[in-house]
Amino acid sequence: KFSKQSWGLENEALIVRCPRQGKPSYTVDWYYSQTNKSIPTQERNRVFASGQLLKFLPAAVADSGIYTCIVRSPTFNRTGYANVTIYKKQSDCNVPDYLMYSTVSGSEKNSKIYCPTIDLYNWTAPLEWFKNCQALQGSRYRAHKSFLVIDNVMTEDAGDYTCKFIHNENGANYSVTATRSFTVKDEQGFSLFPVIGAPAQNEIKEVEIGKNANLTCSACFGKGTQFLAAVLWQLNGTKITDFGEPRIQQEEGQNQSFSNGLACLDMVLRIADVKEEDLLLQYDCLALNLHGLRRHTVRLSRKNPSKECF
C-alpha cells in the first residue's frame, strides 16, 4: 500500500522520497529490502540517505531494487517501500513508456507542462526543454520556474517533452532528465461548481477500533483541463497538516481522471489504528474551484464486532 515506483537513468541523479510522511523532526532510516542492510547517511557515498530522501548520485543500473524506509517517532514507526528501477540510457531518440511520467493535457488557455519530480532536487534555473529530442526554440516557448509555458497551443504541439536540469550536491553537479507526454484538447472545456461524488453528505462510516480506515473525497469540476480545482480533507475545520495527528494523513488519488469526459479529483484520507477519539471528529471533504466550495461531512461510528453464533 505504501509503496512508490521511482525510476531514473544510469549516470544521472535520482532522488526518491519515502512514501510515508512524517514531521521533519522524525528520523527516517533507509534499508536495502533484500539484505536489510542499512543505507549510510554519509554524503561521500554514491548512494546515501538524507532524512526522507534517498539519493543516488549518480544512479547505476545495479541500484535497481526495493528500498525500505522507516519513519520513527517517539510513539510509532511507519514503514514505506520505494521500488527503484535504473535504466540504461537509450541510444536513439525514442523514450520508452516505462520512462514516461504522467501525461498532461493542455488547451489554448492553459498550456503548462511541469517538470516531473523536480521539487526533490537542488536545481537552479533555467530548465532546458526538448520536444521529441529537439531543443525548443522560439518565442512561443517560455521556461518559467519548474514548468514550460507554450503560447497559442496547436494540435501540433502534442508530443513528448523532456526537461533537463542540473542537481547540485556539495558543489558537485549531476544531470537529471524527465519526460512526459503532452496532449492538446480540441474541444472547449467548461467549469462547474464542484460536485462531490463521495462521500455522501452527512455519511456515517463504520470503522473498527484499532484497524485502519480510508475515506475518499471525490469531486468533479467540469469538462476538460481545469485551471484551478482541488479536493482536500479537514478535521474539525483544520488542515490535516496543522491538525498534528501523524496517524491521519491525506494522499492524492488519481490526479485528474476523466470519467464521462468530466475532470475529477480524488483525495484519500488514511487513518491508521483508529482510536475512540477519532469518532468525535468531523471529517470535512472540501471541493473547490474558481466558482466556489462545497463541503460534505463524514462522521465515524464504531462497527460492532460480528457476533458468532454457536
Epitope: 461548481f193 453528505q201 479537514q234 474539525n236 475545520g237 483544520t238 488542515k239 468531523q282 470535512d284 472540501l286 473547490l288 466558482h291 466556489g292 466550495l293 462545497r294 463541503r295 460534505h296 461531512t297
Partner: nanobody, 118 residues
C-alpha cells in the same frame, strides 16, 4: 458594518464587519450589495477554515476579502472603485455547505452605504 462612504471613481474603501456572534470555524462569510432598484448581488465570500476566497466576476482583481480571527472581523478592501459599485454593502454569514460569491446567506448585518461618483 463600517467603512462605507463617498469616493471618486478610481478610489479605495475598506469595509469592516464585527462578527463576534458567528462561529468562526467551518463557516462561509461574505459580502453582498444592493443598488437602488436592482437585485441583491453577491460580491465576495471566504471559507473561514482555510481562508479560501471567491469573487464575483465584476469585482475580480479589484476587491479583496479577508478575515482576522483574533479580532473576529471580516474585511472587504475595495480598490479602483467604479460608479457601478455604488450600493448598500452587507456583511453576511452562514451559507450551509456551499461557499461562493453568490451564496445564499442565513444572516447578515445592517449594511453600509458606498457611493462612487464619476
Amino acid at each position: 458594518e463600517s467603512g462605507g462612504g463617498s469616493v471618486q471613481a478610481g478610489g479605495s474603501l475598506r469595509l469592516s464587519c464585527a462578527t463576534s456572534g458567528v462561529t468562526y470555524r467551518r463557516t462561509c462569510m461574505g459580502w453582498f450589495r444592493q443598488a437602488p432598484g436592482k437585485e441583491r448581488e453577491g460580491v465576495a465570500a471566504i471559507y473561514t477554515s482555510g481562508g479560501f476566497t471567491f469573487y464575483a466576476d465584476s469585482v475580480k482583481g479589484r476587491f479583496t476579502i479577508s478575515q482576522d480571527n483574533a479580532k473576529n472581523t471580516l474585511y472587504l478592501q475595495m480598490n479602483t472603485l467604479k460608479p457601478e459599485d455604488t450600493g448598500i454593502y452587507y456583511c453576511a454569514a452562514e451559507a450551509g455547505d456551499e461557499c461562493s460569491a453568490s451564496s445564499v446567506f442565513r444572516s447578515w448585518g445592517q449594511g453600509t452605504q458606498v457611493t462612487v461618483s464619476s
